[in-house]
Interface confidence: low
């Protein structure tokens, strides 16, 4: 066999190669260190693989904050969690890295985090309205298409990464631990995403995936929240992961995607893939969450759930979706679109950022080149707006 | 190369209007949000409001709501604002940016 | 709106000096903030943007930085070209808002 068929994202593919070796190269990044002392450890919030997660206070000006202890890996993990953090600091939505630390007994290195009074999302999403999910669905969107314009897959979109302050109507996406830097034609690592929100291209161990991974697990989380079934694919193991999706895409489709990129399958896959058809998305709906479906949620939740990573919506098209509509409108009413700095998103409480009525950011950051959607810039500072400029 | 190229200086009588306009060359018109900015020694630098040339979308600040207009020609690539009705106070450097700076255009209002 | 409070308003330094230019945020804008440099004949470009990252053909001379509030632009050898006018730019709240300026002048 000749082995798998090159890929390229079709947006934002070359914007590492027009940048300087040294915004990708995050193993010569210098880590420059604040001070533990600054910080008061106040209560534990959580722990995952790779961290522990505490709320704390900056005693030097009383602020609370977030203190994500790392745990010990590969030191060149750390720096590329902490490059990625710096290069997208001030993005819409992205949450915002405040100083890096070093406990000053064992040594472990602590990034320090803005503060986010987040509900919990199985408490939250149970709750949240037609409205709410486009709004934050759209959010996420803005932080995603940042995200993608400055070269950098996320790898690991679930609800526990997306920080929701919903009396603020305030979001961030969290965890930068798996992102990485998108270069054409190399090949990654599939063992990244959490198992419900993995991509076919992981599944199929095809190594040569982009931005595109993002929006599968974008469309996993849609899926979720208007059909209220959390997870909406839910596999015992990854095996298994692909075999769900299957049952919903159908196999026909698979295979499909397998011959055009001429990925070979896991023989394992053999005796359990079995053959599906194609199920429509209204199959789905029942009373419980036919107030949150819509046919242009179908259409978009269609356009993002599709085997071949080259044919998902990406970020940028994905939010001049019809289903952002409303959104979209009453955003640019209110004045709002998600500016650099932390921005949230206008609605009914802050206005923390923004340009107001323009669903595309830039502020005047560079008041030279403030991307159109990508956000953020303000007054001069060319980031690509979406598609754009540094293709 | 990127460029932002305003239109020229304009003396006005009070009351009247006045259409500036900045064409953009060197990169893509509709990838990135327009600002406009005024300038007079008095208030310093003053952020006027945004126009998403993509969408047609604008934002203002409130202090300039009314005053100016902001709209964009995708197939020029230009960018234009509109002030109304104006006095000496509206006697300023106007700046659009974009990708980058633009050149300029002074106004002044005088009988 | 944020005011933004720039100092000093003007400066005198000499060729190779270090100097600092500093503007205080009325409220918290996080690392949103960018530096401006103006020269004698209008024409504008930015030096600094998210507080500290230099945008790309500024020389490294220039670095910005923040304290709390106060973010600082830095001048580490002055050059005969930076004898200019400098702004800082909030934008992390609707409307911007710059600073008043420093006006750099050579001693």
């Known amino acids: 066999m000749s082995g798998p068929v090159p890929s390229r994202a079709r947006v934002y593919t070359d914007v590492n190669t027009h940048r300087p070796r040294e915004y990708w190269d995050y193993e010569s990044h210098v880590v420059e260190w604040g001070n533990q002392d600054d910080y008061q450890l106040v209560r534990k919030l959580g722990r995952g693989k790779y961290s522990e997660v505490f709320e704390a206070i900056n005693i030097t000006n009383n602020e609370k904050v977030v203190v994500k202890i790392l745990k010990p890996v590969k030191k060149k993990k750390i720096k590329r969690e902490i490059k990625i953090l710096e290069n997208l600091r001030g993005g819409p939505n992205i949450i915002t890295l405040a100083d890096i630390v070093k406990d000053p007994v064992s040594r472990t290195p602590a990034l320090v985090f803005e503060h986010v009074n987040n509900t919990d999302f199985k408490q939250l999403y149970q709750t949240l309205t037609d409205y709410d999910i486009r709004f934050y669905m759209y959010e996420i969107l803005k932080a995603l298409d940042y995200c993608h314009s400055m070269g950098i897959m996320h790898r690991d979109v679930k609800p526990h990464n997306v920080m929701i302050d919903h009396e603020h109507r305030k979001l961030r996406l969290i965890d930068w631990g798996l992102a990485e830097f998108y270069h054409p034609g190399q090949e990654y690592n599939v063992r990244v995403a959490s198992r419900y929100f993995k991509g076919p291209e992981l599944l199929v161990d095809y190594q040569m995936y982009d931005y595109s991974l993002d929006m599968w697990s974008l469309g996993c989380m849609l899926a979720s929240m208007i059909f209220r079934k959390e997870p909406f694919f839910h596999g015992h193991d990854n095996y298994d992961q692909l075999v769900r999706i299957a049952k919903v895409l159908g196999t026909e489709d698979l295979y499909d995607y397998i011959d055009k990129y001429n990925i070979e399958l896991d023989p394992r896959f053999n005796d359990i893939l079995g053959r599906h058809s194609r199920k429509r998305w209204e199959r789905f709906v029942h009373s419980e969450n036919q107030h949150l479906v819509s046919p242009e949620a179908l259409d978009f939740l269609d356009k993002l759930l599709r085997y071949d990573h080259q044919s998902r919506l990406t970020a940028r098209e994905a939010m001049e979706h019809p289903y952002f509509y409303t959104v979209v409108k009453d955003q640019a009413r209110m004045g709002s679109s998600s500016m650099p700095g932390g921005s949230t998103p206008v609605s009914s409480a802050n206005m923390m950022s923004g340009i107001s009525s323009v669903p595309t950011p830039s502020p005047l950051g560079p008041l030279a080149g403030s991307p159109v959607i990508a956000a953020a810039n303000p007054l001069g500072m060319p980031v690509p707006a979406a598609a754009g400029a540094q293709q | 190369q990127v460029q932002l190229q305003q239109s020229g200086a304009e003396l006005v009588r009070p009351g009247a209007s006045v259409t500036l306009s900045c064409k953009a060359s060197?990169?893509?018109?509709?990838?990135?949000?327009m600002h406009w900015v005024k300038q007079t020694p008095v208030h310093g630098l003053e952020w006027i409001g945004v126009?998403?040339?993509?969408?047609?979308?604008?934002a203002y600040n409130q202090k300039f709501r009314g005053k100016a207009i902001l709209t964009a020609d995708k197939s020029s690539s230009t960018a234009y604002m509109e002030l109304r009705s104006l006095t000496s106070e509206d006697s300023a450097v106007y700046y659009c940016?974009?990708?980058?700076w633009g050149t300029g255009t002074t106004v002044t209002v005088s009988s | 709106d944020i005011q933004m409070t720039q100092s000093p308003s003007s400066l005198s330094a000499s060729l190779g000096e270090r100097v600092s230019l500093t503007c205080r945020a009325s409220?918290?804008?996080?690392?949103?903030l960018n530096w401006l440099q103006q020269e004698p004949d209008g024409t504008i470009k930015r030096l600094i943007y998210?507080?500290?990252s230099l945008d790309s053909g500024v020389p490294k001379r220039f670095s910005g930085s923040r304290s709390g509030s106060d973010y600082s632009l830095t001048i580490s050898s002055l050059e005969s070209e930076d004898f200019v006018d400098y702004y800082c730019?909030?934008?992390?709240?609707?409307?911007?808002?710059f600073g008043g300026g420093t006006k750099l002048e050579i001693k």
């Open positions: 998210a507080t500290s």
């Open positions: 409220q918290d804008i996080g690392s949103s």
């Open positions: 060197g990169y893509k018109f509709t990838d990135y949000q």
């Open positions: 730019l909030q934008y992390a709240i609707f409307p911007y808002t």
């Open positions: 940016t974009g990708f980058v």
């Open positions: 126009l998403d040339p993509g969408t047609g979308g604008t």
